[in-house]
């Protein structure tokens, strides 16, 4: 059987809001009082197992006591009254559990969305935490009827559980309680028909035009609750590498379709697009975006020729020279489309002319000793390009006019080259560059720039501490100018070794020092100077600094009969490298003297 | 981003032959001159043979000239090294690279012995 307690707390549950003040009281049975020998002054209160302060409690007569917190903080505490029985032993009388927390505020920023083909969800901001258990009750009529209530699991949203009814307003609002109080939200009123998010558009399809090569046709198909809504589109796209998007001006979409053109796209370029709609009146929510779809522009004829150059071979003969017409494939972005061959055109001054038809980006001829033009077009399915004309003059004609002023420095991780142009008008500039070694050819790159430049840096990501030799030469339309080189490193480092130094003659009191320059290989930049570093075995180090020019230096004020360590250091912009240590012994005597 | 991958090397016995390709992505592949370079153990890096872009100019180091044969095709992005009557001398890694440019394979082994 149950035992009786011995008494009570009131409250039974109780609830505080936190920060306030609360006193519980707790009131022993008379029964209890003779049984155990006790009255309530005989009442010790616990919270959590731990006693509770004397200054906190009150005895109120022989059979209550009470207790008071203040400021009540905790969230939950065991409060239990138990008393001494028989002055001693502690025995629990009776316990409750003690919440703390606060009432609920009243829920702002109720919207309601209607996602296709689902019911309507509503969410909300609940407020601050009320740390107790709230309920929170999604409340909908219409002006005659109510709907069935929507209990919340989480406290921030619900799903009612009637489909919604369209162009007909509803009035929506959110009731909030807990144990210490209840509380609505303002009530919103809508046409469930302006929350709808529609399903993502579909089955969206990319054709291009042979005729145009800047647009693409897309289609795709739309719900809009089965053709209940009228849809307006928000169209994006954006080549397949990029990853930003670029947006179809949203006023051009503005009215319900299933088609569309985008314009102004570059030819021969692959597009990725998506799309989504909303409501025309622009109520409501954006669908999702539809799965991405693809489409390719059609080709067009390249937008312009390719850079064009020639080198001419050693030749053996008198009569002939070998020619080498070389070019560059177009990038992409100009050759709108698959470059299927390049058209070359060789005219001699006062003959027919002579076409070839070539895959590749070179092609090697044997003229005569003439005056020649060449003209090159790159070819696709579409058309040609405009020509690159290049004159080739006769091998007895002098260039003249060079570029001046021609400099190249290092700036940003570039190579950068630039110059004067010469005084008469320029067709295009060509520049040739190459390591130099000693170890390999200068096979040259090449590339080709506007006759309105006259600064610019060498394509390609080049090599540290490598010697680069420039070469600048004006095209004009009667055939190339002269050329101007210079050498030029992106950066530089300490030479990889140092000069070895030998002797070409000593004398009692001096000694004349020979080197080879560093080959270009180990320079690792532009050698500015040497130092000679020179010292007896006792004495101290003396040093010289020499110009790079030199190769060999006089040291003079020697002591005879004396052994002399000598190194050599070379220096760069970005620091020096010692060579080897060499040893010479100064004569006792100079040439001819005696003792 | 730029990639060089030769391929090619191995085993092969004195007066044998060998084809290296090096398959180059990344970069205009027949806008720059290539070259094949070589690191025999214990060795620097030493020149083989160039190429220019379009293919037309070729250039050999005199210890491989009449040997072996450097070509290119610029639709496939690839460079090819022939090696013919090889020498237990030409035992190497091998490497591909852009002849002035900082782009360069991660190299194949190519040994011969007998």
């Known amino acids: 059987q149950l035992l009786e307690p011995c008494g009570y707390i009131y409250p039974e549950f109780p609830v505080v809001q936190r920060g306030s003040n609360f006193t519980a009281i707790c009131v022993l049975k008379e029964a209890c009082l003779q049984h155990y020998y006790v009255n309530a002054s005989y009442i010790v209160w616990k919270t959590n197992h731990a006693a509770v302060p004397r200054e906190q409690v009150t005895v109120i007569n022989r059979t209550t006591s009470s207790v008071t917190f203040t400021d009540v903080v905790l969230p939950s505490v065991q409060l239990t009254c138990n008393i001494l029985s028989f002055g001693q032993i502690e025995q629990n009388v009776y316990g409750v559990t003690m919440l703390s927390g606060f009432p609920p505020d009243k829920p702002t920023n109720l919207t309601c969305i209607v996602n296709e083909g689902k019911n309507m969800l509503c969410q909300w901001d609940p407020g601050r935490e009320t740390y107790l258990e709230t309920n929170y009750t999604l409340k909908s009529e219409w002006a005659t009827e109510k709907f069935p209530d929507c209990q919340s699991k989480h406290g921030t949203s619900c799903m009612v559980s009637y489909m919604p009814t369209y162009y007909v307003n509803i009035e929506v609002w959110v009731e909030a309680e807990n144990a210490l109080g209840k509380v609505s939200s303002e009530s919103i009123n809508f046409d469930p028909v302006d929350k709808v998010k529609p399903t993502p558009p579909y089955n969206l399809s990319v054709t291009n035009s042979e005729e145009l090569s800047s647009i693409l046709k897309l289609s795709w198909v739309s719900s809009g609750l089965g053709g209940l809504l009228d849809l307006k589109s928000d169209i994006q796209y954006r080549t397949k590498d990029a990853s930003t998007w670029i947006q179809v001006p949203l006023e051009d979409t503005m009215s319900p379709r299933t088609s569309f053109t985008v314009q102004d796209l570059k030819p021969f370029t692959e597009y990725v697009f998506r799309i989504r709609s909303i409501k025309d009146s622009g109520k409501g929510y954006w669908s999702d975006w539809s799965e991405e779809a693809s489409g390719t522009t059609y080709e067009d004829r390249p937008s312009r020729p390719p850079s064009f150059w020639y080198k001419t071979n050693p030749s053996h003969g008198q009569e002939y020279r070998s020619v080498r017409l070389i070019w560059k494939a177009l990038p992409l972005s100009e050759a709108n489309g698959k470059i299927l061959d390049y058209e070359v055109i060789l005219t001699q001054s006062k003959s027919v002319s002579q076409t070839y038809t070539v895959t590749g980006t070179e092609l090697t001829v044997n003229l005569t000793n003439d005056r020649y033009v060449a003209s090159l077009a790159a070819r696709n399915k579409v058309g040609k390009s405009a020509a690159a004309v290049l004159t080739i003059p006769s091998p007895h004609v002098t260039a003249a006019y060079s570029v001046v002023n021609l400099k190249a420095f290092p700036k940003d991780n570039l190579l950068w080259v630039e110059w004067t142009p010469p005084p008469k008008p320029v067709s295009k500039y060509i520049l040739e560059w190459c390591v130099l070694s000693e170890n390999a050819p200068c096979v040259e790159d090449w590339q080709q720039e506007d006759a309105t430049v006259n600064r610019t840096h060498l394509r390609g990501r080049l090599l540290e501490s490598k010697c680069y030799q420039i070469t600048v030469t004006p095209v004009f339309a009667t055939g190339p100018g002269g050329s101007e080189s210079l050498k030029a490193y992106l950066k530089q480092a300490a030479p990889a070794r140092g000069p070895t130094v030998r002797t070409k003659k000593v004398g009692k009191n001096e000694a004349v020092l020979a080197w080879d320059q560093i080959p270009v290989d180990d320079q690792n930049g532009f050698i500015r100077n040497y130092s000679i570093s020179y010292r007896t075995s006792v004495g101290k180090e003396m040093v010289v600094h020499v110009d790079s020019s030199h190769t060999e230096y006089t040291l003079s004020s020697l002591s005879s009969d004396t052994l002399y360590m000598v190194r050599m250091a070379a220096y760069t912009d970005e620091g020096g490298k010692d060579g080897p240590e060499f040893t010479f012994t100064t004569p006792k005597f100079a040439q001819g003297e005696i003792e | 981003q730029v990639q060089l991958q030769e391929s090619g090397g191995g085993l092969v016995q004195p007066g044998g032959s060998l084809r290296l390709s090096c398959a180059v992505s990344?970069?205009?592949?027949?806008?720059?001159?290539m070259k094949w370079v070589r690191q025999a153990p214990g060795k620097g890096l030493e020149w083989v043979s160039s190429?220019?872009?379009?293919?037309?100019?070729?250039y050999y180091a005199d210890s491989v000239k009449g040997r072996f044969t450097i070509s290119r095709d610029n639709t496939k992005n690839t460079l090819y090294l022939q090696m013919n009557s090889l020498k237990t001398e030409d035992t190497a890694v091998y490497y591909c690279a852009a002849q002035n440019l900082d782009y360069r394979g991660q190299g194949t082994q190519v040994t011969v012995s007998s």
């Open positions: 990344g970069f205009t592949f027949s806008n720059y001159a």
């Open positions: 190429i220019s872009g379009g293919g037309g100019a070729t």
